[in-house]
């Protein structure tokens, strides 16, 4: 886990102050408003998760 001001999070993750850890950019599909998703902006946007088929 990354502490603020140290080495960046690993590829595919971004620092979350809310969670106090590196968080997976993949989760921005389901929770696009998460605080760390701005740091994931380099990744192409994915469609939002369907609740039901």
């Amino acid at each position: 886990e990354q502490a603020p001001g140290t080495a960046p999070c690993s590829r595919g993750s971004s620092w979350s102050a809310d969670l106090d850890k590196c968080a997976d950019c993949a989760s921005c599909r389901a929770r696009p408003h998460s605080d760390f998703c701005l740091g994931c902006a380099a990744a192409p946007p994915a469609p939002f998760r369907l609740l039901w088929p």
Partner: antibody, heavy 119, light 111 residues
């Protein structure tokens, strides 16, 4: 250290009711969706219900098998999640686990509480 | 609902060898960037534990002996070299949409 403690299981007759509780600690509870998942030899692992956050107006989602009979709720002030189960059937017999998920992964699991529906 | 089919249902692998478990989804659970597939380990008498998320990312504290791969509908969990403590049942789970579903499990025995 993350801790999840389920309770409230036991033996209940068909058609009866039961309320399960889960107390959580060691992670930012108010930021996590909470799930109930059950496990039986017949059906394996089966997702039951999910409750989201205050900012989502505590939106709830249920498996088809739980709709109309089960109600999930949470109390953020107590870092707790509940599952009210009504009109219980023999096929609801299982170990019930609570599990937090930020979005996709069931990051932690409690020890489970056993529910037996039998006459 | 998305159906996840695991194979084999059980396998026995010699200590130090490779265990390979397959999970096939009834529809794609991947975008061009990520795959929404997880793997869990459940040791006898214990609760499930997250091993791998998003098809290939190890959860914190999981040994590098475990690896996951795949996209679309076909996913694989590999364990190499297997150790005694890997005796467990392994489950895949998707998070593409609700309802979340799990595979039927693969029981791994170490010879």
């Amino acid at each position: 250290e993350v801790k999840l403690g389920e309770s409230g299981g036991g033996l209940v007759q068909p058609g009866g009711s039961m309320k399960l509780s889960c107390v959580a600690s060691g992670f930012p509870f108010t930021k996590y969706w909470m799930n109930w998942v059950r496990q039986s030899p017949e059906k394996g692992l089966e997702w039951v219900a999910e409750i989201r956050l205050k900012s989502d107006n505590y939106a709830t989602h249920y498996a088809e098998s739980a709709k109309g009979r089960f109600t999930i709720s949470r109390d953020d002030s107590r870092s707790s999640v509940y599952l009210q189960m009504n009109n219980l059937r023999a096929e609801d017999t299982a170990i019930y686990y609570c599990s937090p998920t930020y979005a996709d992964t069931m990051d932690y699991w409690g020890q489970g509480t056993s529910v037996t529906v039998s006459s | 609902d998305i159906v996840l089919t695991q194979s084999p249902a059980s396998l026995a692998v010699s200590l130090g060898q490779r265990a390979t478990i397959s999970c096939k989804a009834s529809q794609s659970v991947s975008t061009s960037t990520y795959s929404y597939m997880q793997w869990y380990q459940q040791r006898p008498g214990q609760s499930p534990k997250l091993l791998i998320k998003y098809a290939s990312k190890l959860d914190s504290g999981v040994p590098a002996r475990f690896s996951g791969s795949g996209s679309g509908t076909d996913f694989t969990l590999n364990i190499h070299p297997v150790e005694e403590e890997d005796t467990a049942t392994y489950y895949c789970q998707h998070s593409w949409e609700l309802p979340y579903t799990f595979g039927g499990g693969t029981r791994l025995e170490i010879k």
